[in-house]
């Protein structure tokens, strides 16, 4: 298994992956295979009303660039607190002994994997965005999840009752073959998006490729600068009962997803008022309704807030509310 894989993002479309070669390889490592797949945002993020008091915006940080060659321990898995700046404690004698045992186990386990788990396949030609290797078959080991390294357990062995989470078919996952180096720049990724990266060491290229169990790492690309800006006009409809319906377009490719909109409006001469519009209410009205407006000239600005933070305020939109003096309304409240 490749050791200590770390991933960082240096732009909104790239992730840099680095690793160390296996400590006890079975033969010579001829190349590495790197697969990556986009991870969906947690569905709960789409459903929560972030305008409710006390509900904090979700914290989503991208994978920060390397500080130095040796700062790889700062790679964040989904289980780590991104705010927690922690360092490791000194190792005890029992831990050192345990690591030696694990190293020995790893070699034995890899031998087992080569002989039992993987069905060797014919050589593959070329690399590229689409995996041209549908012939490669792998028995289910159970999905390891977004941990940095896949640590095998007894439940991971075949013919046991481990439940595996289905992943997309391998032949549709982008991959790269890496020869003579322990790093890769993955390009062409979507901005502010989580990716799960799978890394395998292979000790034979032809006639049959033999590769290790995968190590996994997760990373998120950096945000795109203007992706959360509302483009196009903010339109308005003025109803007969001093209600104004504001409408705008959702940013096409936001950083992650838009969790809320802020509407800032003011009547000329008055102070600014703020309104929060959740995804749910935006989905209902494609905007929001300002009610009980006093007659006068108004200006309104809107900005979106995504998982990465705030977009820019729109240019002000202006409208005038006349004095209807309690004219009966046809609009249901």
């Amino acid at each position: 298994v490749p050791l200590d894989p770390i991933s960082v993002s240096n732009s909104s479309s790239q992730i840099i992956l680095k690793w160390k070669p296996p400590s006890d390889p079975n033969g010579n490592i001829t190349h590495y295979l790197v697969f990556w797949e986009r991870q969906a945002e947690d569905s709960e993020l789409f459903e929560l009303d972030y305008c409710l008091k006390g509900l904090k915006l979700p914290s989503r940080t991208w994978s920060p660039p390397f500080e130095s060659e040796d700062s790889q321990k700062h790679n964040q898995s989904e289980y780590e607190d991104s705010a927690g700046e922690c360092c490791s404690c000194p190792k005890t004698d029992s831990q050192i002994l345990k690591e030696l045992e694990e190293s020995s186990f790893r070699k034995t386990f890899e031998d087992y994997l080569h002989n039992v788990v993987f069905v060797p396949r014919k050589t593959s030609s070329g690399t590229g965005a689409e995996d041209p290797r549908p012939s490669r078959k792998r028995r289910s080991l159970g999905d390891v999840g977004n941990v940095t390294v896949a640590v095998p357990t007894v439940a991971a062995f075949p013919n046991t009752s481990s439940t595996s989470v289905p992943t997309s078919p391998e032949e549709h996952r982008p991959f790269e073959k890496v020869v003579n180096k322990e790093s890769l720049v993955i390009s062409g990724l979507r901005h502010f998006t989580g990716y799960r990266i799978e890394l395998q060491a292979c000790n034979q290229d032809t006639p049959e490729e033999r590769c290790s169990v995968a190590a996994y790492v997760s990373a998120r690309t950096m945000p795109e600068a203007k992706a959360d800006d509302i483009v196009g006009p903010v339109t308005h409809e003025i109803f007969e009962n001093n209600v104004v319906h504001l409408m705008w377009q959702e940013p096409k490719e936001p950083n992650g997803l838009i969790v809320l909109y802020e509407v800032s409006y003011r009547r000329y001469g008055d102070e600014e008022l703020h309104l929060c519009v959740s995804r749910k209410h935006f989905a209902l009205e494609r905007g929001c309704r300002l009610r009980g407006l006093s007659p006068g000239n108004y200006s309104v600005r809107i900005r979106a807030t995504s998982l990465a933070g705030n977009g820019s305020w729109t240019e002000p939109t202006y409208f005038y509310v006349t004095d209807y003096l309690d004219v009966p309304s046809n609009i249901a409240k």
């Epitope: 109803f239 377009q249 749910k280 249901a332």
Partner: antibody, heavy 122, light 110 residues
Framework: QMQLVQSGAEVKKPGESLKISCKGY????????IGWVRQMPGRGLEWMGI????????RYSPSFQGQVTISADKSISTAYLQWSSLKASDTAMYYC???????????????WGQGTLVTVSS | QTVVTQEPSFSVSPGGTVTLTCGLT?????????PSWYQQTPGQAPRMLVH???TRYSGVPDRFSGSILGNKAALTITGAQADDESDYYC??????????FGGGTQLTVL
């Protein structure tokens, strides 16, 4: 391909309970409001109510408030319409429809299920 | 309670033009009701034609157009075809997720 698929036709007796379903495919179900529409035999469309599957918030037409219950299970992308005690006058075709899909800037019922025929007869 | 009115029936010759309207028993229909129009052929689910007064839904032929005529919403079909023979419903959006449908117009292409 976005699709709303409704459960099959039902024949019930007055006083019985019933729950019909509408399953969404090909879009983020929990993030879109789903409405229910009734069409009695030979009659026009009547808007009944709407639900946001993400948190199950509902809005009802005054005519249907207290007569039916709209619910949803976002984990299986399904909305429901249910009656606790059916009447002969509930005999109708019931449609689910997605409110204002993102392709639509304004308010409209953009995508419809195929309908569920409910027959209530003694 | 808001009542939305439509002509119960209408006839048009093939190739002709017909305008169906959608009004309110009290008051006038404006763009702020976001009038939408639906076509329903017998035994089929309704299909949206126009939303937001005049925007055609994807895949809807351009012979269907929506507008406001006086104090009503209108759906105009130009160059009527035999398969336009259907029931047509308008819906007005009242805010807060609430719609009211009109009684429908049965269109016959003679």
């Amino acid at each position: 391909q976005m699709q709303l698929v409704q459960s099959g036709a039902e024949v019930k007796k007055p006083g019985e309970s019933l729950k019909i379903s509408c399953k969404g495919y090909g879009y983020r179900f929990s993030d879109n409001w789903i409405g229910w529409v009734r069409q009695m035999p030979g009659r026009g469309l009547e808007w009944m109510g709407i639900i946001y599957p993400g948190d199950s918030e509902t809005r009802y037409s005054p005519s249907f408030q207290g007569q039916v219950t709209i619910s949803a299970d976002k984990s299986i992308s399904t909305a429901y319409l249910q009656w606790s005690s059916l009447k002969a006058s509930d005999t109708a075709m019931y449609y689910c429809a997605r409110h204002a899909p993102l392709a639509v800037a304004g308010m409209a019922l953009g995508d419809w299920g195929q309908g569920t025929l409910v027959t209530v007869s003694s | 309670q808001t009542v939305v009115t439509q002509e119960p029936s209408f006839s048009v010759s093939p190739g002709g033009t017909v305008t169906l309207t959608c009004g309110l028993t009290s008051g006038s229909v404006s763009t702020s009701y976001y009038p939408s129009w639906y076509q329903q052929t017998p035994g089929q689910a309704p299909r949206m034609l126009v939303h937001s007064t005049s925007t055609r839904y994807s895949g809807v032929p351009d012979r269907f157009s929506g507008s406001i005529l006086g104090n009503k919403a209108a759906l105009t079909i130009t160059g009527a075809q035999a398969d336009d023979e259907s029931d047509y419903y308008c819906a007005l959006y009242m805010g807060g997720g609430i719609y009211v449908f009109g009684g429908g117009t049965q269109l016959t292409v003679l």
